[in-house]
Protein backbone atom coordinates (compact mmCIF):
# COMPACT_ATOMS: atom_id res chain seq x y z
CA UNK A 1 0.00 0.00 0.00
CA UNK A 2 2.93 2.37 0.66
CA UNK A 3 4.76 1.60 -2.57
CA UNK A 4 4.60 4.05 -5.44
CA UNK A 5 2.88 2.72 -8.55
CA UNK A 6 2.98 4.49 -11.91
CA UNK A 7 -0.38 3.89 -13.52
CA UNK A 8 -0.88 4.29 -17.25
CA UNK A 9 -4.47 3.04 -17.55
CA UNK A 10 -4.65 2.77 -21.34
CA UNK A 11 -2.58 0.13 -23.11
CA UNK A 12 -3.28 1.88 -26.40
CA UNK A 13 -4.74 5.10 -27.76
CA UNK A 14 -5.74 5.81 -31.36
CA UNK A 15 -5.86 9.39 -32.65
CA UNK A 16 -6.55 10.91 -36.08
CA UNK A 17 -3.73 12.93 -37.63
CA UNK A 18 -4.05 16.60 -36.76
CA UNK A 19 -5.85 15.94 -33.47
CA UNK A 20 -4.48 16.01 -29.93
CA UNK A 21 -3.59 12.83 -28.04
CA UNK A 22 -4.14 12.58 -24.29
CA UNK A 23 -1.79 10.15 -22.53
CA UNK A 24 -2.85 9.42 -18.98
CA UNK A 25 -0.54 8.78 -16.04
CA UNK A 26 -1.12 8.80 -12.29
CA UNK A 27 1.06 8.14 -9.25
CA UNK A 28 -0.15 6.48 -6.07
CA UNK A 29 2.29 8.28 -3.76
CA UNK A 30 3.90 11.70 -3.39
CA UNK A 31 7.22 10.10 -2.46
CA UNK A 32 9.93 9.67 -3.48
CA UNK A 33 10.25 13.38 -4.19
CA UNK A 34 11.45 14.06 -7.73
CA UNK A 35 10.24 14.89 -11.22
CA UNK A 36 8.36 12.82 -13.77
CA UNK A 37 9.28 12.57 -17.43
CA UNK A 38 7.53 11.20 -20.49
CA UNK A 39 9.48 9.26 -23.10
CA UNK A 40 8.67 7.69 -26.43
CA UNK A 41 10.28 4.28 -26.61
CA UNK A 42 12.40 2.48 -24.02
CA UNK A 43 16.09 1.92 -23.44
CA UNK A 44 19.06 4.08 -24.35
CA UNK A 45 17.53 5.46 -27.55
CA UNK A 46 14.30 6.69 -26.00
CA UNK A 47 13.11 10.16 -26.91
CA UNK A 48 12.25 12.72 -24.22
CA UNK A 49 8.74 14.05 -24.80
CA UNK A 50 8.23 16.03 -21.60
CA UNK A 51 10.27 16.85 -18.49
CA UNK A 52 8.37 18.24 -15.50
CA UNK A 53 11.50 19.94 -14.15
CA UNK A 54 12.93 21.78 -17.14
CA UNK A 55 12.85 22.30 -20.89
CA UNK A 56 10.54 23.66 -23.57
CA UNK A 57 7.94 21.31 -25.03
CA UNK A 58 5.65 23.48 -27.19
CA UNK A 59 3.32 20.67 -28.31
CA UNK A 60 2.82 19.26 -24.81
CA UNK A 61 0.38 20.55 -22.22
CA UNK A 62 -0.28 19.00 -18.83
CA UNK A 63 -3.82 18.01 -17.97
CA UNK A 64 -3.52 19.12 -14.33
CA UNK A 65 -1.39 21.64 -12.47
CA UNK A 66 1.86 19.76 -11.92
CA UNK A 67 3.28 22.44 -9.62
CA UNK A 68 0.61 21.70 -7.01
CA UNK A 69 2.35 20.08 -4.06
CA UNK A 70 -0.13 17.22 -3.76
CA UNK A 71 -0.59 16.54 -7.48
CA UNK A 72 -0.67 12.87 -8.48
CA UNK A 73 -1.93 13.31 -12.07
CA UNK A 74 0.83 13.52 -14.66
CA UNK A 75 -1.28 13.09 -17.79
CA UNK A 76 -0.22 15.06 -20.87
CA UNK A 77 -1.80 16.14 -24.13
CA UNK A 78 0.24 16.29 -27.35
CA UNK A 79 -1.16 18.58 -30.03
CA UNK A 80 -1.23 18.28 -33.82
CA UNK A 81 -0.46 14.56 -33.99
CA UNK A 82 1.25 13.23 -37.13
CA UNK A 83 2.10 9.64 -38.15
CA UNK A 84 5.67 10.31 -36.96
CA UNK A 85 4.35 10.48 -33.37
CA UNK A 86 3.26 6.83 -33.36
CA UNK A 87 4.98 4.67 -30.73
CA UNK A 88 4.87 3.60 -27.10
CA UNK A 89 4.93 6.36 -24.51
CA UNK A 90 6.23 5.81 -20.97
CA UNK A 91 5.56 7.93 -17.89
CA UNK A 92 8.63 7.67 -15.63
CA UNK A 93 9.13 8.76 -12.02
CA UNK A 94 12.55 9.96 -10.87
CA UNK A 95 13.92 10.47 -7.37
CA UNK A 96 15.66 13.77 -6.72
CA UNK A 97 19.45 13.73 -7.00
CA UNK A 98 22.44 15.79 -8.14
CA UNK A 99 23.83 16.17 -10.74
CA UNK A 100 21.16 13.86 -12.15
CA UNK A 101 17.84 12.66 -10.82
CA UNK A 102 17.64 8.86 -10.53
CA UNK A 103 15.08 6.86 -12.49
CA UNK A 104 12.83 5.12 -10.01
CA UNK A 105 9.82 3.54 -11.68
CA UNK A 106 8.16 3.47 -15.09
CA UNK A 107 4.59 2.99 -16.15
CA UNK A 108 3.72 0.04 -18.39
CA UNK A 109 3.47 2.26 -21.47
CA UNK A 110 0.69 3.46 -23.76
CA UNK A 111 0.89 2.70 -27.47
CA UNK A 112 -0.18 5.64 -29.63
CA UNK A 113 -1.40 4.81 -33.11
CA UNK A 114 -2.22 7.49 -35.65
CA UNK A 115 -5.15 7.20 -38.08
CA UNK A 116 -5.43 9.09 -41.31
CA UNK A 117 -7.27 12.37 -40.92
CA UNK A 118 -10.90 12.08 -41.92
CA UNK A 119 -11.53 13.83 -45.24
CA UNK A 120 -13.80 16.83 -45.03
CA UNK A 121 -17.07 16.10 -46.89
CA UNK A 122 -17.03 17.65 -50.38
CA UNK A 123 -19.83 19.97 -51.44
CA UNK A 124 -22.15 18.49 -54.09
CA UNK A 125 -21.63 19.81 -57.63
Amino acid sequence: EDELQVIQPEKSVSVAAGESATLRCAMTSLIPVGPIMWFRGAGAGRELIYNQKEGHFPRVTTVSELTKRNNLDFSISISNITPADAGTYYCVKFRKGSPDDVEFKSGAGTELSVREAALAPTAPL
Partner: antibody
Protein backbone atom coordinates in the same frame (compact mmCIF):
# COMPACT_ATOMS: atom_id res chain seq x y z
CA UNK B 1 21.26 -10.73 5.18
CA UNK B 2 21.89 -7.02 4.70
CA UNK B 3 24.96 -5.76 6.53
CA UNK B 4 26.72 -2.40 6.65
CA UNK B 5 30.21 -2.54 8.15
CA UNK B 6 31.83 0.60 9.50
CA UNK B 7 35.17 1.03 11.28
CA UNK B 8 34.65 1.54 15.00
CA UNK B 9 36.71 4.70 15.41
CA UNK B 10 38.79 7.35 13.66
CA UNK B 11 41.01 9.93 15.36
CA UNK B 12 42.22 12.98 13.43
CA UNK B 13 43.70 16.43 14.05
CA UNK B 14 41.77 19.70 13.62
CA UNK B 15 41.99 21.09 10.09
CA UNK B 16 42.60 17.66 8.56
CA UNK B 17 40.21 15.52 6.50
CA UNK B 18 38.90 12.02 7.08
CA UNK B 19 37.34 9.51 4.70
CA UNK B 20 35.11 7.03 6.48
CA UNK B 21 33.84 3.83 4.89
CA UNK B 22 30.65 1.79 4.88
CA UNK B 23 30.99 -1.66 3.31
CA UNK B 24 27.71 -3.19 2.17
CA UNK B 25 26.86 -6.87 1.75
CA UNK B 26 23.81 -9.11 1.40
CA UNK B 27 21.98 -7.09 -1.27
CA UNK B 28 22.48 -5.44 -4.67
CA UNK B 29 24.62 -2.46 -3.72
CA UNK B 30 23.77 -0.36 -6.78
CA UNK B 31 20.00 -0.58 -6.25
CA UNK B 32 19.48 1.28 -2.96
CA UNK B 33 20.36 4.73 -1.69
CA UNK B 34 22.86 4.95 1.16
CA UNK B 35 22.26 7.71 3.69
CA UNK B 36 24.65 9.20 6.24
CA UNK B 37 23.60 10.42 9.70
CA UNK B 38 25.55 12.32 12.37
CA UNK B 39 25.07 12.01 16.13
CA UNK B 40 27.02 14.25 18.51
CA UNK B 41 27.66 12.86 22.01
CA UNK B 42 24.43 12.92 24.00
CA UNK B 43 22.57 14.57 21.10
CA UNK B 44 20.01 13.59 18.48
CA UNK B 45 20.26 12.32 14.93
CA UNK B 46 21.12 14.66 12.06
CA UNK B 47 20.68 13.68 8.41
CA UNK B 48 23.74 14.62 6.32
CA UNK B 49 22.93 13.36 2.84
CA UNK B 50 22.54 10.32 0.64
CA UNK B 51 24.03 8.75 -2.48
CA UNK B 52 22.71 6.38 -5.14
CA UNK B 53 25.50 3.87 -5.85
CA UNK B 54 24.05 3.05 -9.28
CA UNK B 55 24.83 6.51 -10.62
CA UNK B 56 26.71 8.47 -7.96
CA UNK B 57 23.89 11.03 -7.65
CA UNK B 58 23.71 12.67 -4.24
CA UNK B 59 21.59 14.88 -1.97
CA UNK B 60 22.88 16.94 0.95
CA UNK B 61 21.36 19.03 3.66
CA UNK B 62 22.56 22.62 3.08
CA UNK B 63 24.83 22.87 6.14
CA UNK B 64 26.86 19.81 5.06
CA UNK B 65 27.29 20.73 1.38
CA UNK B 66 30.81 22.08 1.85
CA UNK B 67 31.70 19.70 4.68
CA UNK B 68 30.78 16.22 3.43
CA UNK B 69 31.61 14.57 0.11
CA UNK B 70 29.79 11.32 -0.62
CA UNK B 71 31.24 8.75 -3.03
CA UNK B 72 30.98 5.03 -3.76
CA UNK B 73 33.22 2.29 -5.09
CA UNK B 74 30.95 -0.25 -6.77
CA UNK B 75 33.81 -2.73 -7.27
CA UNK B 76 34.08 -3.17 -3.49
CA UNK B 77 30.44 -2.36 -2.57
CA UNK B 78 31.66 0.44 -0.35
CA UNK B 79 30.28 3.92 0.30
CA UNK B 80 32.52 6.69 1.57
CA UNK B 81 32.00 10.00 3.28
CA UNK B 82 34.87 12.46 3.34
CA UNK B 83 34.69 15.23 5.94
CA UNK B 84 36.99 18.20 5.39
CA UNK B 85 38.42 21.04 7.52
CA UNK B 86 37.64 19.16 10.71
CA UNK B 87 36.90 20.93 13.98
CA UNK B 88 35.78 19.70 17.40
CA UNK B 89 32.16 20.21 16.22
CA UNK B 90 32.69 17.30 13.84
CA UNK B 91 33.45 14.89 16.70
CA UNK B 92 30.48 12.53 16.59
CA UNK B 93 29.28 9.07 15.68
CA UNK B 94 28.55 8.78 11.95
CA UNK B 95 26.15 6.12 10.73
CA UNK B 96 25.44 4.84 7.25
CA UNK B 97 22.03 3.34 6.55
CA UNK B 98 20.16 1.77 3.64
CA UNK B 99 17.41 -0.65 2.72
CA UNK B 100 14.38 -1.02 0.50
CA UNK B 101 12.83 2.01 2.17
CA UNK B 102 15.77 4.28 1.32
CA UNK B 103 14.05 5.47 -1.86
CA UNK B 104 11.04 6.42 0.26
CA UNK B 105 13.05 8.17 2.95
CA UNK B 106 13.13 5.56 5.71
CA UNK B 107 16.06 3.39 6.64
CA UNK B 108 15.72 -0.29 7.44
CA UNK B 109 19.37 -1.21 7.97
CA UNK B 110 22.06 0.70 9.85
CA UNK B 111 25.80 0.31 10.29
CA UNK B 112 27.28 0.20 13.78
CA UNK B 113 28.63 3.72 13.39
CA UNK B 114 32.11 5.21 13.29
CA UNK B 115 33.14 7.36 16.25
CA UNK B 116 35.14 10.32 14.96
CA UNK B 117 37.33 12.17 17.44
CA UNK B 118 38.86 15.46 16.34
CA UNK B 119 41.64 16.32 18.73
CA UNK B 120 45.15 17.72 18.62
CA UNK C 1 13.83 22.46 4.98
CA UNK C 2 11.04 20.85 6.98
CA UNK C 3 11.54 21.11 10.75
CA UNK C 4 10.40 18.37 13.12
CA UNK C 5 9.41 19.18 16.72
CA UNK C 6 9.19 16.26 19.12
CA UNK C 7 7.67 16.16 22.60
CA UNK C 8 8.18 15.48 25.37
CA UNK C 9 12.00 15.68 25.49
CA UNK C 10 11.98 13.19 28.34
CA UNK C 11 9.40 10.83 29.75
CA UNK C 12 9.50 8.47 32.72
CA UNK C 13 7.12 5.54 32.90
CA UNK C 14 6.72 2.15 34.53
CA UNK C 15 6.66 -1.31 32.96
CA UNK C 16 3.08 -2.07 31.88
CA UNK C 17 2.11 1.57 31.34
CA UNK C 18 1.03 3.10 28.02
CA UNK C 19 2.93 6.13 26.71
CA UNK C 20 2.52 8.46 23.73
CA UNK C 21 5.23 10.50 22.02
CA UNK C 22 4.25 13.26 19.61
CA UNK C 23 5.93 14.85 16.62
CA UNK C 24 4.96 17.98 14.72
CA UNK C 25 6.12 18.93 11.22
CA UNK C 26 6.61 22.55 10.18
CA UNK C 27 4.53 21.90 7.04
CA UNK C 28 2.21 19.26 5.64
CA UNK C 29 4.10 15.99 5.15
CA UNK C 30 0.93 13.94 4.51
CA UNK C 31 1.60 10.50 6.03
CA UNK C 32 5.33 10.47 5.30
CA UNK C 33 6.81 10.00 8.75
CA UNK C 34 9.06 7.33 10.27
CA UNK C 35 9.86 6.47 13.90
CA UNK C 36 13.10 4.96 15.24
CA UNK C 37 14.21 3.54 18.58
CA UNK C 38 17.80 3.91 19.74
CA UNK C 39 19.30 2.28 22.80
CA UNK C 40 22.43 3.59 24.51
CA UNK C 41 25.55 2.92 22.41
CA UNK C 42 23.57 1.22 19.61
CA UNK C 43 22.41 2.13 16.11
CA UNK C 44 18.86 3.38 15.55
CA UNK C 45 16.24 0.78 14.62
CA UNK C 46 13.26 1.46 12.37
CA UNK C 47 9.93 1.01 14.15
CA UNK C 48 7.31 2.60 11.91
CA UNK C 49 7.22 4.14 8.44
CA UNK C 50 4.58 6.04 6.47
CA UNK C 51 3.09 7.11 9.83
CA UNK C 52 1.48 3.79 10.74
CA UNK C 53 3.15 0.82 9.03
CA UNK C 54 5.09 -1.33 11.52
CA UNK C 55 8.55 -2.37 10.35
CA UNK C 56 9.34 -6.06 10.15
CA UNK C 57 9.71 -7.71 13.54
CA UNK C 58 8.37 -4.76 15.55
CA UNK C 59 5.96 -5.86 18.33
CA UNK C 60 2.30 -4.93 17.92
CA UNK C 61 2.33 -2.92 21.17
CA UNK C 62 3.89 -0.15 19.07
CA UNK C 63 1.53 1.88 16.89
CA UNK C 64 1.90 5.04 14.84
CA UNK C 65 -0.80 7.49 13.82
CA UNK C 66 -1.34 10.94 12.37
CA UNK C 67 -1.11 12.82 9.10
CA UNK C 68 -0.47 16.31 7.84
CA UNK C 69 1.59 17.97 10.57
CA UNK C 70 0.65 16.03 13.73
CA UNK C 71 1.88 12.51 14.49
CA UNK C 72 2.18 10.21 17.45
CA UNK C 73 3.84 6.98 18.50
CA UNK C 74 2.01 4.95 21.14
CA UNK C 75 3.55 2.13 23.14
CA UNK C 76 1.08 -0.07 24.99
CA UNK C 77 2.08 -2.12 28.01
CA UNK C 78 5.69 -0.96 28.20
CA UNK C 79 8.32 -3.68 28.41
CA UNK C 80 11.80 -3.31 29.95
CA UNK C 81 13.38 -3.45 26.48
CA UNK C 82 11.34 -0.43 25.31
CA UNK C 83 13.31 2.10 27.33
CA UNK C 84 15.68 4.27 25.30
CA UNK C 85 15.52 7.15 22.85
CA UNK C 86 12.86 7.65 20.17
CA UNK C 87 13.14 9.81 17.07
CA UNK C 88 10.68 10.84 14.39
CA UNK C 89 11.90 11.62 10.87
CA UNK C 90 9.99 12.96 7.90
CA UNK C 91 10.16 11.01 4.64
CA UNK C 92 9.00 13.90 2.45
CA UNK C 93 12.38 14.66 0.93
CA UNK C 94 15.28 14.65 0.36
CA UNK C 95 16.46 16.36 2.43
CA UNK C 96 15.15 14.41 5.43
CA UNK C 97 15.21 15.69 9.00
CA UNK C 98 14.83 14.10 12.43
CA UNK C 99 13.04 15.31 15.51
CA UNK C 100 15.18 16.18 18.52
CA UNK C 101 14.30 12.92 20.28
CA UNK C 102 12.40 11.67 23.32
CA UNK C 103 14.20 9.89 26.15
CA UNK C 104 12.02 7.21 27.71
CA UNK C 105 13.28 6.18 31.14
CA UNK C 106 12.13 3.70 33.76
CA UNK C 107 10.25 5.27 36.68
Amino acid sequence: QVQLQQPGAERVKPGASVKMSCKASGYTFTSYWITWVKQRPGQGLEWIGDIYPGSGSTNHIEKFKSKATLTVDTSSNTAYMQLSRLTSEDSAVYYCATGYGSSYGYFDYWGQGTTLTVSS
Amino acid sequence: DIQMTQSPASLSASVGETVTITCRASENIYSYLAWYQQKQGKSPQLLVYTAKTLAEGVPSRFSGSGSGTQFSLKINSLQPEDFGNYYCQHQYGPPFTFGSGTRLVIK
